[in-house]
Amino acid sequence: YDFTNCDFEKIKAAYLSTISKDLITYMSGTKSTEFNNTVSCSNRPHCLTEIQSLTFNPTAGCASLAKEMFAMKTKAALAIWCPGYSETQINATQAMKKRRKRKVTTNKCLEQVSQLQGLWRRFNRPLLKQQ
């Protein structure tokens, strides 16, 4: 999906009002210096691409973040403010099997969510030059 035509300001507002708090809750008890940010993004569409990937694609050591509150809100925000996003995703996932895995917060998931926080911060400051 090409995130170029999203309403970035509305997505930013949803992040600031609610998604950010859920990310903080998920990370509670973790020091902010515990993980190094290794994932970056260059502009808002690129940031959303990376955010989508880290939020919804299973990775080694972190099977799924999709059950988390911040993930469900991210999915809804993208569906509301990115034209055609929900239709694209409906078609892409029609054949997905329904299975509910137990929620497990692993260190790898904490690291992944830390990366997500960095990507969201970058998304909110699009005019900053890439370091």
Epitope: S64, A66, K67, M72, K75, A76, A92, K98, R99
Partner: nanobody
């Protein structure tokens, strides 16, 4: 098995109100995000509102201030209160449950038709 059954659609005049209901079974609303999508003839399905288990909600600009999403966990039912209806709100409205298995995966109801016309 997840089941979502919508009701409350119908014909209403511009400026009128309707309340859509979505009776859910096979899961508890306590743990899932619920949404209302709509699809107008010849248009893509769009998410107009979503509600989360912490009580927070998101709304599309086109309905903000006119539509209110809510959930009664004791009845396992989600609602969409639609006020100040406009002809452009005419669509089939679908209740949806976040399937939480990844991007865009939802379980769907069969839909209920809302027609706004004088």
């Amino acid at each position: 098995e997840v089941q979502l059954v919508e009701s409350g659609g119908g014909l209403v005049q511009p400026g009128g109100s309707l309340r859509l209901s979505c009776a859910a079974s096979g899961f508890s609303l306590d743990y899932y995000a619920m949404g209302w999508f709509r699809q107008a003839p010849g248009k893509e399905r769009e998410l107009v509102s979503a509600i989360f288990s912490d009580g927070s909600a998101l709304y599309a600009d086109s309905v903000k201030g006119r539509f209110t999403i809510s959930a009664d966990n004791s009845k396992n039912t989600a609602y969409l209160q639609m006020n100040s209806l406009k002809p452009e709100d005419t669509a089939v409205y679908y209740c949806a449950k976040d399937r939480d298995t990844g991007i865009g995966a939802y379980d769907w109801g069969q839909g209920t038709l809302v027609t706004v016309s004088s």
